[in-house]
């Protein structure tokens, strides 16, 4: 079998959702020695980065300007290290917002329940689409999906302290056009767990693993870099649509 | 504002060699991306070779096979084209383009030419049999 070299981790700095004509930036985290990194856009070659010096640094930061419903879409990346290629990456799914209108999104039977109690948020958009996307403020990979004409349900079922926070609703022009977020709705589950004042409650910063973590080379690094990789790609899981 | 102008396109036999070149004026950032693309009649036009001034790093379509070479001279802002062993199916329409680098280091370019802002006004490479 033809010998490749670890796949690259792909990520999103910030996040996967860029407002459209915003600037996206995606990182591709290799191997320190890497001489070519090379991302890809639906299959497609899209850019190509040559570090230097190659030995210095684990990664690429690609930038992608003027975020547009053109650049939207699925990438991954690979890299080279003499004349030996990487496996491909994962895939990277860039979804543009700020596209056309504003949902409403709405709860029932209110934002204040107790614990065990139905939940159903409701977003609503009148322009032409039928897919609607509700989020969770710190959980912006569990995307919920819904369909409906100009409205969509997500019943929640019996809900627990678990499922307090903020949520925004989206609706969908395509996978990867997204409406202007909807002004968030903060869920409040109070209730009968043992003790709810001590009850976990979701962060509210942006998802911890939305961050580009390159580096720069140490004697240290040096002997660790491979050993960090594998166990990286092994622990690392991207959401897919 | 960026202006780009092309010239040494022409005809020639199959085989034979021509320089292209383009002159470029009003670029205010300190690393770029400038590059060769080339349309076919009722195509999109297609990436030759690609050159950032952060490097200097070359990228090279794979049709390329080393007949061809990108340069740019910094002192005169002048970006060319070395095309040898030209064959029937370089005829086109060539472009010079320019566009922002595809990362903060500057040595990285993007390959797709909607990425690219400015554009010459072309000149035609015909390569006859």
């Known amino acids: 079998p033809k010998q490749t070299l670890p796949k690259p981790i792909i990520r999103a700095e910030s996040t996967y959702m860029v407002p459209k004509e915003k600037q996206a930036t995606l990182c591709c985290q290799g191997s320190y020695g890497a001489v070519e990194y090379q991302l890809h856009f639906e299959g497609s070659l899209f850019a190509v980065e040559r570090p230097k010096p190659p030995e210095r640094i684990n990664g690429v930061k690609f930038h992608i300007p003027d975020m547009n419903s053109r650049k939207a879409g699925r990438y991954s990346c690979i890299y080279r290290v003499g004349e030996l290629w990487s496996e491909r990456s994962d895939l990277l799914d860039l979804v543009v917002t700020e596209m056309y209108d504003t949902p409403t999104l709405s709860v029932h039977p209110g934002p204040e329940v107790t614990s065990g109690e139905k939940v159903t948020f409701y977003c609503r958009l009148d322009t032409a689409t039928s897919m609607f996307l509700l989020l969770k403020e710190g959980r912006s990979r569990d995307v919920q999906r819904s369909y409906g004409k100009v409205q969509a349900e997500f019943p929640m079922g019996p809900v627990t302290t678990a499922h307090r926070g903020s949520y925004r609703c989206f609706g969908s022009y395509n996978n990867y056009a997204w409406s202007f977020p909807s002004e968030p709705v903060k869920l409040l589950v109070t209730g009968d767990i043992e003790n709810t004042s001590l009850a976990p409650t979701d962060p509210t910063f942006p998802d911890s693993w939305d961050t580009c973590l390159l580096t720069r080379e140490t004697g240290l690094q040096k002997d660790l870099a491979l050993w960090d990789h594998t166990a990286q790609n092994h622990h690392h899981h991207h959401h897919h649509h | 504002d960026v202006q780009l102008v092309e010239s040494g396109g022409g005809s020639v036999q199959a085989g034979g060699s021509l320089r292209l070149s383009c002159a470029a004026s009003?670029?205010?950032?300190?690393?770029?991306?400038m590059g060769w693309f080339r349309q076919f009649p009722g195509k999109e036009r297609e990436r030759v070779a690609l050159i950032n001034t952060g490097g200097p790093t070359t990228f090279y379509a794979d049709f390329v096979e080393g007949r061809f070479t990108i340069s740019l001279d910094n002192a005169k802002n002048t970006l060319s084209l070395q095309m040898n062993s030209l064959k029937p199916e370089d005829t086109a329409m060539y472009y010079c383009?320019?566009?922002?680098?595809?990362?903060?280091?500057?040595?990285?370019?993007?390959?797709?030419?909607?990425?690219?802002?400015?554009w010459g006004q072309g000149t035609q490479v015909t390569v006859s049999s």
């Open positions: 009003g670029y205010r950032s300190r690393h770029y991306c």
């Open positions: 383009a320019a566009g922002p680098p595809s990362s903060d280091s500057g040595s990285g370019c993007y390959v797709p030419e909607y990425m690219y802002n400015y």
